[in-house]
């Protein structure tokens, strides 16, 4: 779809008469009337198959015509098609001079034609504006035309249709050819896949919009690249989703078993040592001078008995010294290494005690890790999910999510292409090794049948007497061309009467 | 045990503001991404906000996007919700909530409510 | 925004009663499902999560079972307790949704 566009610039008529030599009086009142055509090597008489426009007289014997596009005039003169323009055309325009105010052919004496000119080529679609000048014996025209594109309509014929458009099914504008060009921010054939945040993690997030990084299940911050623990876990942090490591001090499965009151709770006073005996429990050993539970109270040196588990109170000018017996350290001889008896095994491991009770090991039954049992043992460590699937380490069946175009336990089978029905009205699909083909039904185009195309209203032969079809895709009808002697809209008729337009 | 104390909740007129706060024990705070989460009188729940634990980063439902902030100071254990140019229907039970948009919300408060009307 | 449709919106049951109640997603959620309680004046509790995974401390009578689009919460022998405001919530996709809610009265 397009526009022939003719733009009358001059016209000489120095005389003021007509084709016939004749004066016109008072002056010739000239206007124009324009056929365009298919191309003819001998420009003959017969249909305008392009169009026809005719111009308000413009002037009178000799005028120069006023660009009047910008103020919703008629010049450039607008002809329009609605078919691939075929690059060649004939041209005929005629000159006329207008006695009274009704310019139509009926109304018109036979000999007021003052000027005809026909012209025939090869044209190009194109902003640039070919300049023309004919010249007759008692006339001259000046004038430029050229053939652009409708709007949405691109390519060499004007032929390929492209709508710009920022919706769900494509964010894009066109390209002079007539190739979609993304908008910013979005990717693919059509333009509706996002390019998510720059650094966003290919497996763990996902974007609806450009520049986001929504996270998958499991997953938190702006890139999408650290964990979220348990929902149980209490003070515990995670390596992937859904673990619960626990901080220091802090045991059992969701991290809620206080190993460490000393440190969380601060209890005993005086500036008194600490030391955990057990979950919730703990020893405070007091300074020289102070004695109770919680060294609250004051006393003397090494009458308090400072020294913890067996340990002797040596005094000294500064204080006092605790000697410890083995298997203790520490200020007040208050640190012991864990052993079995504290039940430090989580999970059903069992312990056993090495090196003569000093330290012991713990052994982890099926699906549990880590020196204490406190892990659980991860399913996706060995990643076993091909072509990219997501690797999920919960849930009672499914391990893995596929990416699309996949399925089975471990993403390992393609899904047919063809299983979502890609191919629009109607279109039968065909999966091919790497991706897919639409046959479409007759009227439809393009990859995936979604673009309609016109059917050829000239393939039933509907003209008659050797006559010339030309389809109307817009309309998806036909115009026949008739051979000499011949009329109608399928030149049926031999001629018998005039033709109502006078070529 | 996990305890979640929400605060700050009362009648606002149309166009004002309002700042929520959440004291957050008995778990690291540190570690989790938290959210908000409110319910109309009489209606159903309805995710407002969320923030990551690793990093701050912040979600908004679309109708609060622009008037609400979530923010969080770990070192007090609290989060915050900033509510300004509040509207007749921001009116509802706000709770705050252990979570991120794409996992359970295991903990809530006992819920602060917010009353926009003139 | 994914869709949640609970089913029904109010149901009556006795004591004893097998109950069960249903969360229809509009599209596929995989198993990234949680139900949530929640008492007249008092915040939701999470009962399960990932679907059939019961939360700590919740009683094992509670049981939750689908995958994709469909799920059930199943409550095997009512307790008075139990009577409350039941809420299906997906967080597979951003913004994380709620069901409309189903209310379990006593009959």
């Known amino acids: 779809s397009g526009v022939f566009q003719l733009q009358l610039q001059e016209f000489i008529n120095e005389r003021g008469v007509l084709a016939s030599g004749r004066p016109c009086e008072p002056g010739c009142r000239t206007f124009f009337r324009v056929c365009l055509k298919h191309f003819q090597a001998v420009v003959s008489p017969g249909p305008c198959t392009f169009g026809t426009v005719s111009t308000p007289v413009l002037g009178t014997n000799s005028f120069a015509v006023r660009d009047d596009s910008s103020g919703g005039g008629r010049n450039p003169l607008q002809l329009p098609f609605n078919f691939t323009w075929p690059g060649t055309f004939s041209l005929i325009i005629e000159a006329w001079h207008a006695p009274g105010d009704d310019l139509r052919p009926e109304a018109l004496p036979p000999d007021a034609l003052i000027s005809k000119i026909a012209i025939q080529g090869s044209l190009a679609v194109g902003q640039n504006w070919l300049l023309d000048e004919q010249t007759s014996t008692l006339t001259r025209l000046r004038y430029s035309y050229r053939v652009i594109c409708s709007d949405n309509y691109y390519g060499d014929n004007c032929s390929r249709l492209c709508k710009k458009r920022n919706d769900h099914f494509g964010h894009y504008v066109c390209q002079p050819d007539g190739n979609l060009s993304c908008l910013p921010g979005w990717t693919g054939e059509y333009c509706q896949q996002p390019i998510c945040l720059s650094g966003c993690h290919e497996q763990n997030g996902y974007c609806s919009k450009p520049a986001e990084c929504l996270c998958r299940p499991g997953w938190q911050g702006r890139l999408c690249n650290e964990c979220i623990p348990h929902n149980g876990c209490r003070h515990g942090t995670c390596s992937t989703p859904w673990q619960c490591t626990c901080d220091e001090g802090w045991g059992g499965l969701f991290c809620d078993q206080d190993l460490n009151y000393c440190t969380h709770h601060s209890p005993c006073k005086n500036g008194a040592t600490c030391s955990n005996s057990g979950q919730r429990s703990y020893t405070c050993t007091c300074r020289p001078g102070y004695t109770g539970v919680d060294c609250e109270l004051e006393l003397s040196e090494c009458d308090s008995n400072p020294c913890r588990n067996g340990g002797s109170c040596k005094d000294q000018e500064d204080g006092y010294h605790c000697l410890c017996p083995p298997g203790y350290y520490g200020l007040h001889c208050e640190h012991s290494t864990l052993s079995c008896a504290d039940s430090p095994c989580f999970n059903g491991g069992s312990c056993r005690e090495r090196n003569q009770g000093a330290n012991y090991a713990c052994e982890c039954p099926p699906n549990f890790t880590g020196s204490n049992c406190e892990k659980k043992v991860d399913r996706c460590t060995s990643n076993p999910c091909a072509n990219g699937g997501q690797c999920l380490n919960r849930g009672p069946s499914r391990m893995c999510r596929c990416r699309p175009g996949f399925t089975g336990t471990y993403c390992e089978l393609h899904v047919s292409d063809c299983a979502r029905n890609p191919c629009a009205h109607g279109g039968t699909c065909h999966d091919l090794e790497n991706g897919l083909m639409c046959t479409c039904p007759a009227g439809f185009s393009g990859r995936r049948c979604e673009v309609r195309t016109s059917i050829d209203a000239c393939a039933s032969s509907p003209c008659f007497n050797r006559a010339t079809c030309y389809t109307d895709l817009s309309t998806d009808t036909f115009v026949c061309n008739c051979p000499y002697g011949f009329v109608g809209s399928r030149c049926e008729f031999p001629v018998g009467l005039p033709p109502s337009f006078p070529w | 045990e996990v305890q979640l104390v929400e605060s700050g909740g009362g009648l606002v007129q149309p166009g004002g503001s309002l700042r929520l706060s959440c004291a957050a024990s008995g778990f690291t705070f540190s570690n989790f991404p938290m959210a908000w989460v409110r319910q109309a009188p009489g209606k159903g729940l309805e995710w407002v906000a969320t923030?990551?634990?690793?990093?701050?980063?912040?979600y908004y439902r679309d109708s609060v996007k622009g008037r609400f902030t979530i923010s969080r100071d770990n070192a007090k254990n609290s989060l915050y919700l900033q509510m300004n140019s509040l509207r007749a229907e921001d009116t509802a039970v706000y709770y705050c909530?252990?979570?991120?948009?794409?996992?359970?919300?295991?903990?809530w408060g006992q819920g602060t409510l917010v009353t926009v009307s003139s | 925004d994914i869709q949640m449709t609970q089913s029904p919106s109010s149901l009556s049951a006795s004591v004893g009663d097998r109950v069960t109640i249903t969360c229809r997603a509009s599209q596929d959620i995989y198993i990234n499902l949680a139900w949530y309680q929640q008492k007249p004046g008092k915040a939701p509790k999470l009962l399960i999560f990932?679907?059939?995974d019961l939360a700590d401390g919740v009683p094992s009578r509670f049981s939750g079972s689908g995958s994709g689009t469909d799920f059930t919460l199943t409550i095997s022998s009512l307790q008075p307790e139990d009577f409350a405001t039941y809420y299906c919530?997906?967080?597979?996709?951003?913004?994380?949704?709620f069901g409309q809610g189903t209310k379990l009265e006593i009959k």
């Open positions: 923030i990551s634990s690793s990093d701050g980063t912040t």
């Open positions: 919530q997906q967080y597979d996709y951003y913004p994380p949704t």
């Open positions: 990932d679907t059939s």
């Open positions: 909530a252990r979570g991120y948009y794409n996992s359970p919300f295991a903990y």
